[in-house]
């Protein structure tokens, strides 16, 4: 029975005399008067078996002690660690000439674990062992002896096992412990590659090349290799593995990404939190699922937020000129979280009697600059038929519109070609200006050309230069424009609409809001 003792991870013990419980029972020759087995205690009061010999008074000593058979376990080189005490001959009276201060270590390779008789000549000598510290009379007087430790190695070995032998030639020795071990490079993980327990090579300078295998949930980037050195240390790691998509490195392992995290590719990156408007419900996600109503375009990276189609364009304005129509609009309030917004124009030709009976306009109609994929917020439509009702739809689209097309993404206007629109309004007046509002009034156009259905007021901050305008519609010839900013210059245009369409906008009226209320009568010129 062998008790367990702790040794370095790169050493595999084949024999440890200190761990043997009960007698070692090694073979001594001669049987009497030579090596003697002695039981002593270790520091934990556990018995350990030792061998001692001290025939220093008699000449020509040749005392042999042979171990049991020791399996090699595939090792080509083994190490023998001997802890022993050795008396200094000078400390022993009357032994000059007969006392020695060394002993010899031998080995014999064998496939037979039960060899009874091995001739001395069959053993190969490993070394002569001398003490670093021999024990003088002073040591004896102190009654506490230091232990010598000597390590020798032997190899290459080829048979299944071997026997060790200790030859005493007249010394006073106690073998306190004998440990036989071989060295291995212990199982390890480097760069996410696992390298197995590897027995060191036969020579003290040899390197054993070992190919590693990627840990679970990882894949080779470059072929992982290492070299097992003779001392049981791994050397020169080459190549590596990378955690698969959906996994990240943690303590030398590839762990699945937690819920709410993802990793799209086999890289050395960590899992990332799901981008905005997306989620993962399983561990090990390689991408995150978009929230309801949100989408990811084909060319969107997994790291991009999920987005949605834009809302409808705002403030669509039409201007009919015989068989041409100019359309103008503002950007949608909500772009869906994307930059790739563009506009498509849909033209429908509708029957005069039943506006619901509409057909596509066909290829004869031309669009400037283009019909689809417009980056600007205006288009001119030409080559329309005269005296015809047209409905124009402006669709705001982005990279994910195709996943969820909806009428909510378009705005439409209906016009009739070839009817004269009203003339422009000659006079627009600012009746009252406050800090936050302007009261406007105007006259009917000189040439209404029909029944005025409504007036349209377009206004914007002067320094915005018509980039961002607002529209107010009214059937009356006056209106209060509210929600303005104090001390700000605004530009106002007004036009009339009849069944034939919109007339031209009036000349601009520039008004600056006040810091204190006052009445200002406009005369069509700039007011301040």
């Amino acid at each position: 029975v062998t008790g367990s003792r702790v040794y370095p991870a790169n050493e595999v013990t084949l024999l440890d005399s200190r761990s043997v419980q009960g007698e070692l029972g090694w073979i001594a020759s001669p049987l009497e008067g030579g090596w003697e087995e002695v039981s002593i205690m270790d520091e934990k009061n556990t018995p350990i078996r030792t061998y001692q010999v001290c025939n220093v008074m008699e000449a020509s000593q040749n005392n042999w002690l042979r171990t049991d058979w020791i399996t090699r376990e595939g090792a080509q080189r083994v190490y023998i660690e001997i802890k022993f005490t050795l008396r200094d001959c000078n400390s022993l009276p009357g032994v000059m000439g007969t006392c020695k201060e060394t002993f010899n270590l031998y080995y014999y390779e064998s496939d037979n674990d039960k060899e009874r008789f091995i001739r001395e000549s069959q053993f190969g000598k490993i070394d002569t062992i001398a003490a670093d510290e021999s024990f003088t009379q002073v040591d004896i007087g102190d009654r506490i002896m230091k232990l010598n430790t000597e390590i020798r190695d032997v190899g290459p070995l080829s048979k299944k096992g071997f026997y060790l032998a200790f030859q005493d030639v007249g010394a006073c020795i106690a073998l306190v412990s004998v440990r036989v071990f071989y060295k291995k490079c212990p199982l390890t993980v480097r760069n996410l590659a696992q390298f197995p327990d590897t027995i060191t090579g036969a020579d003290t300078s040899s390197l054993v090349e070992v190919r590693g295998s990627c840990v679970n949930n990882s894949e080779e980037k470059d072929v992982p290799k290492m070299y097992c050195g003779a001392d049981g240390e791994w050397l020169v790691p080459i190549g590596n593995c990378l955690c698969n998509a959906g996994h990240e490195e943690q303590n030398g392992e590839c762990q699945a990404c937690k819920i709410g995290y993802y990793k799209a590719l086999s890289t050395d990156a960590s899992c990332a939190k799901c981008p905005p408007h997306s989620y993962s419900v399983w561990e090990g996600a390689t991408s995150c699922t978009c929230d309801r109503g949100f989408f990811r375009a084909d060319n969107d990276a997994a790291s991009m937020p999920c987005t949605r189609p834009p809302s409808a364009p705002l403030n669509l304005i039409s201007n009919v000129n015989e068989t041409s129509v100019n359309l103008e609009w503002s950007s949608p309030q909500n772009t869906g979280g994307r930059q790739d917004i563009s506009y498509n124009v849909v033209c429908k030709k509708c029957g005069a009697g039943d506006p619901s009976k509409c057909r596509p306009c066909g290829s004869g109609v031309h669009y400037t600059p283009q019909q689809n994929g417009l980056k600007t917020t205006r288009v001119s439509i030409t080559d329309l038929l005269a005296h015809t009702n047209y409905t124009f739809e402006i669709w705001a689209v982005n990279g994910v519109s195709k996943y969820n097309p909806s009428p909510d993404q378009s705005v439409s206007v209906t016009v009739t070609t070839n009817q004269a629109a009203p003339s422009s309004i000659a006079l627009v007046q600012a009746k009252e200006v406050t800090r936050y509002s302007v009261a406007l009034a105007w006259l009917e156009p000189d040439r209404p050309n029909g029944v005025i259905l409504e007036y349209e007021v377009k206004y914007y901050e002067k320094d915005q230069n018509e980039r961002s305008y607002r529209i107010v519609r009214t059937a009356a010839r006056n209106t209060d424009i509210k929600g303005l900013n104090p001390l700000t210059s605004y530009v106002f245009h007004v036009r009339a609409r009849t069944a034939a369409g919109y007339g031209d906008f009036s000349e601009p009226l520039e008004v600056t809001t006040n810091t204190v209320p006052s009445r200002i009568i406009g005369d069509g010129a700039n007011s301040t």
Partner: antibody, heavy 126, light 112 residues
Framework: EVQLVQSGAEVKKPGSSVKVSCKAS????????ISWVRQAPGQGLEWMGG????????NYAQKFQGRVTMTRDTSISTAYMELSRLRSDDTAVYYC???????????????????WGQGTMVTVSS | DVVMTQSPLSLPVTPGEPASISCRSS???????????LDWYLQKPGQSPQLLIY???NRASGVPDRFSGSGSGTDFTLKISRVEAEDVGVYYC?????????FGGGTKVEIK
């Protein structure tokens, strides 16, 4: 249970020698040290010397050097102490005592006299 | 040689009460291996001595836990937490670091 059994009382003339034996029963005799301690009537304890197997030879107190010889015969598990040139002040009870040997990873030593013989009275008188 | 000095020479005790014996050495008994090489023995009337404590503070096998040893270097103490009638006798300390081994002069413990 190890016991140390000593030889019987002795009466000796001054100048003569006495040899006291100490036989161990139980245990492995070679596995422990044997020391000899004496106690003069009404006095304290006095260490004379001993044999520690892994030290190789006997070790004697300077006071008894040249007069005392300690030996052991492992075949019969017996230790001996011989004191020569006896004087009247050698009158004492002579004890043999066992010391357990121990070794740590760096040194070896002993763990006290854990078993004692019953004592042998040696009287030196003319 | 190392000289061992014990005190007191005599210690009258009451059963159930604690008792303490001091031992001083002329040289340190602390070895470089960390052990103090000091033992305590009790010799009951008409008997051979028996080991109580070895290496300064380790109780020998079968010794009741009311006995404890302490100290390091040159000053050591044996304590009996609650003296019992069977504890009477002469207590000796002994240095086991160097030869010659040396015993203290002894402390006689007796019931009041």
């Amino acid at each position: 249970e190890v016991q140390l059994v000593q030889s019987g009382a002795e009466v000796k003339k001054p100048g003569s020698s006495v040899k006291v034996s100490c036989k161990a029963s139980g245990g492995t005799f070679s596995s422990y040290a044997i020391s000899w301690v004496r106690q003069a009537p009404g006095q304290g304890l006095e260490w004379m010397g001993g044999i520690i197997p892994i030290f190789g030879t006997a070790n004697y107190a300077q006071k008894f050097q040249g007069r005392v010889t300690m030996t052991r015969d492992t075949s019969i598990s017996t230790a001996y102490m011989e004191l020569s040139r006896l004087r009247s002040d050698d009158t004492a009870v002579y004890y043999c005592a066992r010391e357990l040997l121990y070794c740590s990873s760096t040194s070896c030593g002993t763990h006290g006299f854990d078993i004692w013989g019953q004592g042998t009275m040696v009287t030196v008188s003319s | 040689d190392v000289v061992m000095t014990q005190s007191p020479l005599s210690l009258p005790v009451t059963p159930g009460e604690p008792a303490s014996i001091s031992c001083r050495s002329s040289q340190s008994l602390l070895h470089s291996n960390g052990y103090n090489y000091l033992d305590w023995y009790l010799q009951k009337p008409g008997q051979s001595p028996q080991l109580l404590i070895y290496l300064g503070s380790n109780r020998a096998s079968g010794v009741p836990d009311r006995f404890s040893g302490s100290g390091s270097g040159t000053d050591f103490t044996l304590k009996i937490s609650r003296v019992e009638a069977e504890d009477v006798g002469v207590y000796y300390c002994m240095q086991a670091l160097q030869t010659p081994l040396a015993f203290g002069g002894g402390t006689k413990v007796e019931i009041k």
